[in-house]
């Protein structure tokens, strides 16, 4: 039976050209975690593996940084970055866990606005 | 020594499926992603995508999607691409190749190949 | 997709010759690109990595240069087993492309 719950950011926004950490953790189980994909949509971002280590897809490696741990820093964002991206968990022996994050990309002006005009 | 033995040639009717092996023997078969290729006459190489023994992760090159599936054993080291709905388009040279986990994009030991014809 | 073009698809050359292959990308690829031969009979190896760095085992008379969009091999002086079709790919980004192969033949 899968126990474990995972925990993610949530919903984040990010200034277009900066850096964002993308976050996930894994709780309430036991269970080993073997692997860590990182996707948006269904392409590969990067894979942590406990045994082999980290793997950058060839679209991300320039601007992709493994960690804080089992987390991901995307660099250099653009507009096109903004959307869904998902932490799948593979562990032993519960099976697979997936989180999502969603990720908006916006123009730098936009988010110091956003930043300057918050709801109290 | 490294070595990605696949199967022998294959004829198939239009809209069948035929699936197709690569055995790995002279390496740590989780060290590696497995790639596969396609090759017809006039159309050069086509990388249809790439498989992680390891975990299962497998991640395709959109023109293939839905009509290549790969599976790996990890116990007879052998990796596996089954084609679906066949029709004369998929007639051609199949090739598995190997490419080291982490940082690495090139594929360093290949196949002999495998011919598929797609005649009714 | 990134585009890889080989503009030439046949060449000829004699033994001992200098033969330079050329591949050029669709867009900048930042020196991210491979060189494989494919020998008569199918099988194919991996002669050059990262547009220069010589794969192990490969004879040193053939080396690798480039940037940007245009990038070439180069094979010092011709063997009669480099009678192969030549292929660039690069891995700038998903998917992986090819260009259309070089086929060297002897004068």
């Known amino acids: 039976m899968m126990t474990g719950t995972i925990e993610t950011t949530g919903n984040i926004s990010a200034e277009k050209g900066g850096s964002i950490i993308l976050q996930c953790h894994l709780s309430s189980t036991t269970a080993q975690v073997t692997q860590v994909n990182w996707e948006q949509q269904d392409q590969l971002l990067a894979i942590c593996n406990a045994d082999l280590g980290w793997h950058i897809s060839p679209s991300f490696k320039d601007r992709v940084a493994p960690g804080p741990g089992l987390g991901l820093t995307l660099q250099s964002l653009t507009v096109n970055d903004t959307g869904e991206y998902f932490c799948i968990y593979h562990t032993y022996p519960d099976g697979t866990y997936t989180g999502r994050i969603f990720l908006e990309v916006l123009e730098s002006s936009v988010a110091e606005h956003g930043a300057r005009f918050q709801i109290p | 020594q490294v070595q990605l033995q696949q199967s022998g040639g294959e004829v198939m009717k239009p809209g069948a499926s035929v699936k197709i092996s690569c055995k790995a023997t002279?390496?740590?078969?989780?060290?590696?992603?497995i790639e596969w290729v396609k090759q017809r006459p006039g159309h050069g190489l086509e990388w249809i995508g790439e498989?992680?023994?390891?975990?299962?992760?497998?991640y395709y090159n959109e023109k293939f999607r839905g009509k290549a599936t790969f599976t790996a054993d990890k116990s007879s080291n052998t990796a596996y691409m089954q084609l679906s709905s066949l029709t004369s388009e998929d007639s051609a040279v199949y090739y598995c190749a190997r490419q080291k986990y982490g940082n690495y994009y090139y594929f360093d030991y290949w196949g002999q190949g495998t011919t598929l014809t797609v005649s009714s | 997709d990134i585009q890889m073009t080989q503009t030439t698809s046949s060449l000829s050359a004699s033994l001992g010759d200098r033969v330079t292959i050329s591949c050029s990308a669709s867009q900048g690829i930042s020196n991210y690109l491979n060189w494989y031969q494919q020998k008569p009979d199918g099988t194919v190896t991996l002669l050059i990595y990262?547009?220069?760095s010589l794969h192990s085992g490969v004879p040193s008379r053939f080396s690798g240069s480039g940037s940007g969009t245009d990038y070439s091999l180069t094979i010092s002086n011709l063997e009669p087993e480099d009678i192969a079709t030549y292929y660039c790919q690069h891995y700038s980004k998903l998917p992986y492309t090819f260009g259309g192969g070089t086929k060297l033949e002897i004068k």
């Open positions: 990262y547009t220069s």
């Open positions: 002279g390496y740590t078969f989780s060290n590696y992603w």
């Open positions: 498989i992680l023994p390891v975990s299962g992760s497998a």
